[in-house]
């Protein structure tokens, strides 16, 4: 599930300033921990890289929705 991965107190201090093509993304995690300075999204790419992104950006929200739908459609 895109948002069910538990990353112990991982925070985003900087976010990517360019769009990542949706076909490169595998999953995401919401960061809302109180010990983090801001809410953020960590995208995991198909190459295994983790990238912080700003959930206020339209491309980030669209990518999250797309991954949610993909995940749901993969369920048996």
């Amino acid at each position: 599930q895109p948002d069910s991965v538990s990353i112990p107190i991982t925070c985003c201090f900087n976010v990517i300033n360019r769009k990542i093509p949706i076909q490169r993304l595998e999953s995401y995690t919401r960061i809302t921990n109180i010990q983090c300075p801001k809410e953020a999204v960590i995208f995991k790419t198909k190459r295994g890289k983790e990238v912080c992104a700003d959930p206020k950006e339209r491309w980030v929200r669209d990518s999250m929705k797309h991954l949610d739908q993909i995940f749901q459609n993969l369920k048996p």
Epitope: Q1, P2, D3, S4, R30, T32, P37, K38, E39, P55, K56, K65, D68, Q69, F71, Q72
Partner: antibody
Amino acid sequence: QVQLVQSGAEVKKPGSSVKVSCKASGLTISDTYMHWVRQAPGQGLEWMGRIDPANGNTKFDPKFQGRVTITADTSTSTAYMELSSLRSEDTAVYYCARGVFGFFDYWGQGTTVTVSS
Amino acid sequence: DIQMTQSPSSLSASVGDRVTITCKATEDIYNRLAWYQQKPGKAPKLLISGATSLETGVPSRFSGSGSGKDYTLTISSLQPEDFATYYCQQFWSAPYTFGGGTKVEIK
């Protein structure tokens, strides 16, 4: 530690307006969205709308569109909700809450607004 | 708008009981579901987001499951402090909507 502190209870006449404030500490409000949710006595929760304090962009439940104004002052880390043309059905506890994802992890203590002639 | 139907609206249970509350959306909400606990005179408290993700500090007796339109909150062994009203909320699309609530009372 995140805290959202709201203004005190209000008693208003039908047809008037009310403005409720929500002062945030422990977070930068421009990094998040500030939402307003209300709860009538003995009833459930109802989302009214939200603001992106970074740019002032707002989104509302169409039910409240035109009657509610949400603003934010980033210099004082305060969000405001003003509801106009009050009627008795607007008697409720009004909560502010934060959440960029659409769910709400921190809430104010609530402000009781009573509309009565 | 997406409507959320929660059931039951109230239930009576004893300490130690397993309690299940269900929430049904009028359309697929793709796991964008949150659960809250509210006690009288207090603001709601977030328990679960993303249908299954337990918030920090929430006891493990609370769990969430489901997908598509149908979701469940389970309290595996009810404790005295769990007597409260529980709400589900969808955050797939605005306007964000809540279920009508389930009041868990002492039997």
